[in-house]
């Protein structure tokens, strides 16, 4: 079993200051660890690049909503 206590924590220290087109986004994950200085969202792009974003920004919230919606739509 992996040792969860020693598992590395991913944190975001800076946020992107550019709005990313939802067409470029593949997925997201939230960073909520108390060990991190900021709550954050990490978007993964379709070319597997990871970008830190501020969850308080509306475009970030809208992008998360868009990606959530995609999980409900069967891909054919």
């Amino acid at each position: 079993q992996p040792d969860a206590i020693n598992a590395p924590v991913t944190c975001c220290y800076n946020f992107t200051n550019r709005k990313i087109s939802v067409q470029r986004l593949a997925s997201y994950r939230r960073i909520t660890s108390s060990k991190c200085p900021k709550e954050a969202v990490i978007f993964k792009t379709i070319v597997a690049k990871e970008i830190c974003a501020d969850p308080k920004q509306k475009w970030v919230q809208d992008s998360m909503d868009h990606l959530d919606k995609q999980t409900q739509t069967p891909k054919t």
């Epitope: 709550e39 969850p55 809208d62 959530d68 999980t71």
Partner: nanobody, 123 residues
Framework: EVQLVESGGGLVQAGGSLRLSCAAS????????MGWFRQAPGKEREFVAS????????YYADSVKGRFTISRDNAKNTVYLQMNSLKSEDTAVYYC????????????????WGQGTQVTVSS
């Protein structure tokens, strides 16, 4: 960290209505998709309804469509579940949840949970 407290449950007759509320405290409420789930005795926790961060998109389990309405007030950090035309099969503990990852109806896409409020529908 997000703390969630549900209220509004109780005993109601079949055909009646209840409005559940879920008050959130902690980090940015508007950055979380919110959902309601329920768990009846001896059954697994099941998805009831979910609302997007903007409040523009709502999703419902087939069993509650047309009877239940989810809404949110980001200024008050509160999400609501209006339940009409209640049936005995709606009897359960109702849980409010805040998202932790991608997804809409899967319980494991919600990271934060309230303690639940009991809804009992008598026939």
């Amino acid at each position: 960290e997000v703390q969630l407290v549900e209220s509004g449950g109780g005993l109601v007759q079949a055909g009646g209505s209840l409005r559940l509320s879920c008050a959130a405290s902690g980090r940015s409420f508007s950055s979380h998709r919110m959902g309601w789930f329920r768990q009846a005795p001896g059954k697994e926790r099941e998805f009831v309804a979910s609302i997007s961060r903007s409040g523009e998109n709502t999703y419902y389990a087939d069993s509650v469509k047309g009877r239940f309405t989810i809404s949110r007030d980001n200024a008050k950090n509160t999400v609501y579940l209006q339940m009409n035309s209640l049936k005995s099969e709606d009897t359960a503990v109702y849980y409010c949840a805040a998202s932790g990852g991608m997804g809409i109806s899967a319980p494991n896409s919600y990271a934060y949970w309230g303690q639940g409020t009991q809804v009992t529908v008598s026939s």
